[in-house]
């Protein structure tokens, strides 16, 4: 089976690496533009230079290309707690990240939100907080894990999953309730 190639990939594959086929004349291969630049005019003929121009402020190209426009620089999303790790340059997009003691939670492939790493109060750190993963906590006796926080077994309702972990405490609570009746 021959893999299906898009029109641009088909055109590029006719030319050697680092070149692309002229859109108006498929017998001409033009040199691609370096990263940090974009295609202003195709090369007029074989062996002649492609007219590449540097990206303007607020835009970039991160690899060799024959794009008619540079790509807009990403903005870090304040509402998601993101901070700028490095600013956009002509050949590299903005790099966004989180503050110290925070991790990234990806809601989708290209959208993340910063959250504070769990401190494991009433428990111990099983796995340390990482760039893209919260701390994994193990809770002390008398506590159970709920949404990555160690919660007292006194907050455990019988219908919840915590009943297995908090069984002795629940029995005690039940016992005190029973003994309280007159």
């Amino acid at each position: 089976l021959v893999p299906h190639l898009g029109d641009r990939e088909k055109r590029d594959s006719v030319c050697p690496q680092g070149k692309y086929i002229h859109p108006q004349n498929n017998s001409i291969c033009c040199t691609k533009c370096h990263k940090g630049t974009y295609l202003y005019n195709d090369c007029p003929g074989p062996g002649q230079d492609t007219d590449c121009r540097e990206c303007e402020s607020g835009s970039f190209t991160a690899s060799e290309n024959h794009l008619r426009h540079c790509l807009s620089c990403s903005k870090c999303r304040k509402e998601m707690g993101q901070v700028e790790i490095s600013s956009c340059t002509v050949d590299r997009d903005t790099v966004c990240g989180c503050r110290k003691n925070q991790y990234r939670h990806y809601w989708s492939e290209n959208l993340f939100q910063c959250f504070n790493c769990s401190l494991c109060l009433n428990g111990t750190v099983h796995l340390s907080c990482q760039e893209k993963q919260n701390t994994v906590c193990t809770c002390h006796a008398g506590f159970f894990l709920r949404e990555n926080e160690c919660v007292s077994c006194s907050n455990c309702k019988k219908s919840l999953e915590c009943t297995k972990l908090c069984l002795p405490q629940i029995e005690n609570v039940k016992g005190t309730e029973d003994s309280g009746t007159t």
């Epitope: 999303r77 304040k78 509402e79 809601w107 959250f115 504070n116 949404e147």
Partner: nanobody, 119 residues
Framework: EVQLLESGGGLVQPGGSLRLSCAAS????????MVWVRQAPGKGLEWVSH????????YYADSVKGRFTISRDNSKNTLYLQMNSLRAEDTAVYYC????????????WGQGTLVTVSS
């Protein structure tokens, strides 16, 4: 008590439009970034769009970019989602929610409104 009430869903033909609304109460709406998420039949939650407190910064999933517009009216405590050029793959229950704060979970969200795109 926090309440979010979505409305505006329904049956629409491909290429059609709908405007979803989300009426908020029980919290200071103007202080909260808000989110639209959706759940297609048999699939997980998908983040559709969000908007900051004042309605300046917005985000759209690639699948809806250029077709959907999120907006808010803080004087009416209402969030909106204008959906144009609807496709069959937009069929889902749409929920509005407050942007999570403490961890990757929605602290409050509505009961949802069903959007069905079919000819």
């Amino acid at each position: 008590e926090v309440q979010l009430l979505e409305s505006g869903g329904g049956l629409v033909q491909p290429g059609g439009s709908l405007r979803l609304s989300c009426a908020a109460s029980g919290f200071t709406f103007a202080h909260e970034p808000m989110v639209w998420v959706r759940q297609a039949p048999g699939k997980g939650l998908e983040w559709v769009s969000h908007i900051d407190r004042v309605g300046q910064d917005t985000y759209y999933a690639d699948s809806v970019k250029g077709r959907f517009t999120i907006s808010r009216d803080n004087s009416k405590n209402t969030l909106y989602l204008q959906m144009n050029s609807l496709r069959a793959e937009d069929t889902a229950v749409y929920y509005c929610a407050g942007l999570p704060k403490r961890g990757p979970r929605f602290d409050y969200w509505g009961q949802g409104t069903l959007v069905t795109v079919s000819s």
